[in-house]
């Protein structure tokens, strides 16, 4: 005989297990219907009645399938250091990340919590490391022969122009002056052949690392406590 | 079996708050909410708001914000409901009830009569 | 607010027979509809939640019905205990409302 397809609810077998999409009630003591994601359960099941599910009220959402009496309230509205990648809907709640320029200094499980203003490396200091979605730049000293003369979280250190003839000796924050009317460039720094500056090494200062400018911080509040759930959310 | 005791009726003036309690009892505390429900003499029941004692969140009528704070001690299984401000109209009995999904009460208090008179 | 109506404000009737309480939503409330019986002395029971579902320990004389905005709770072969006044509760939409109540009074 073919095994009895069993509609919920029902009490499982001893010892076994509800089947995907379903909890076990321990007030019923019977296997119940899940409600799927954008719902909530409304009523709960008993003996002889199965879950009733309703859908979420405005910002509110669940992702999962779940028996949640309260469906989860979405997060607070992106501040205005980030940008909304992914609004609220019943069945997703609303994900912030940082604009460009900004990075995440506290991340939260989706999106971010707290954006803070990526470092600017200021004259004399260009970027060694970039900033990235959840890191904040690096900056580093100009080594001899190159420079940077602007507040910037981009402008790595360049090498300074050969002169044939100096008038101004470049440094960390400035680039050399010629007296010639043509100058040349020299190569990026760790280029195979990079030219020596026809100045004497001599000409150039190497400043002190110092601290970059203060990053600015703008808070996302995370959201307040969740609802109370009736177990897991998951399948 | 489930009960739901109230504190004893209470006497105030105008102007001062009071505090009412439910202490649960027979069940798992918080794993259900405890709402509160006002009836005036003779007339019908309002709903005030509810408490998760698993998690202290609470809702609100509209109508009850900044009159009735709503609290809950899970250590000692019972909730509290502090009505601020008090007037002539908030003269009523005041019940607790208890609810696993938000919206139908299975258990309810006894009632705690509050009258408010100089 | 979800205004709930028991245009019945009282009734009587007799040991044995079957009564039929009533209450209307102002809005269609999709069966999210519970009925509760207070005593004289005060207390409060729940009767029947979600229109239709007898809740545990109650007596299996009580059944409600209905849909959209008309809901009714019926009570057969009426006992002298189940002299009381019933309220109906609509929980679709916050913040949950009550009806005004029907006092139950035995002949």
């Known amino acids: 005989l073919p095994a009895q397809v069993a509609f919920t609810p029902y009490a499982p077998e001893p010892g076994g297990t509800c089947r995907l999409r379903e909890y076990y009630d321990q007030t019923a003591q019977m296997c119940c219907s899940k409600c799927p994601p954008g719902q909530h359960a409304k009523v709960f099941c008993t003996k002889t009645s199965d879950t009733v599910c309703d859908s979420c009220e405005d910002s509110t959402y669940t992702q999962l399938w779940n028996w949640v009496p309260e469906c989860l309230s979405c997060g607070s509205r992106c501040s205005s250091d980030q940008v909304e990648t992914q609004a609220c809907t019943r069945e997703q709640n609303r994900i912030c990340t940082c604009r460009p320029g900004w990075y995440c200094a506290l991340s939260k499980q989706e999106g971010c919590r707290l954006c803070a203003q990526l470092r600017k490396c200021r004259p004399g200091f260009g970027v060694a490391r970039p900033g990235t979605e959840t890191s904040d730049v690096v900056c580093k000293p100009c080594a001899p022969g190159t420079f940077s003369n602007t507040t910037s979280s981009t402008d790595i250190c360049r090498p300074h122009q050969i002169c044939h003839v100096v008038a101004i000796p470049g440094n960390a924050s400035m680039d050399a002056v010629c007296t010639s009317t043509s100058p040349t460039r020299s190569m990026a720094p760790g280029a195979v052949h990079l030219p020596q500056p026809v100045s004497t090494r001599s000409q150039h200062t190497q400043p002190t690392p110092a601290p970059s400018t203060a990053p600015g911080t703008s808070f996302l509040l995370p959201v307040g406590p969740s609802p109370p759930a009736e177990g897991s959310t998951g399948d | 079996q489930v009960q739901l005791q109230q504190s004893g009726p209470e006497l105030v003036k105008p102007g001062a708050s009071v505090t009412i309690s439910c202490k649960a009892s027979d069940y798992s505390f918080t794993n259900y909410y405890i709402h509160w429900v006002k009836q005036r003499p003779g007339q019908g029941l309002e709903w005030i708001g509810w408490?998760?004692?698993?998690?202290?969140?609470?809702k609100y009528h509209e109508k009850f914000k900044g009159k009735a704070i709503l609290t809950a001690d899970t250590s000692s299984t019972t909730a509290y409901m502090q009505l601020n401000s008090l007037t002539s109209e908030d003269s009523a009995v005041y019940f607790c009830?208890?609810?696993?999904?938000?919206?139908?009460?299975?258990?309810w208090g006894q009632g705690t009569t509050l009258t408010v008179s100089s | 607010d979800i205004q709930m109506t028991q245009t019945t404000s009282s009734l009587s009737a007799s040991l044995g027979d079957r009564v039929t309480i009533s209450c209307r939503a102002s809005q269609d409330i999709r069966n999210y509809l519970n009925w509760f019986q207070q005593k004289p002395d005060g207390t409060i029971k729940l009767l029947i939640y979600?229109?239709?579902r007898l809740h545990s320990g109650v007596p299996s004389r009580f059944s409600g019905s209905g849909s959209g905005t008309d809901y009714s709770l019926t009570i057969s072969n009426l006992e002298q205990e189940d002299m009381a006044t019933y309220f109906c509760?609509?929980?679709?939409?916050?913040?949950?409302?009550f009806g005004g109540g029907t006092k139950l009074e035995i002949k």
């Open positions: 509760q609509q929980f679709n939409t916050l913040p949950w409302t």
């Open positions: 009830a208890r609810s696993r999904a938000t919206g139908y009460f299975d258990y």
């Open positions: 408490i998760y004692p698993g998690n202290v969140i609470t």
């Open positions: 979600y229109t239709s």
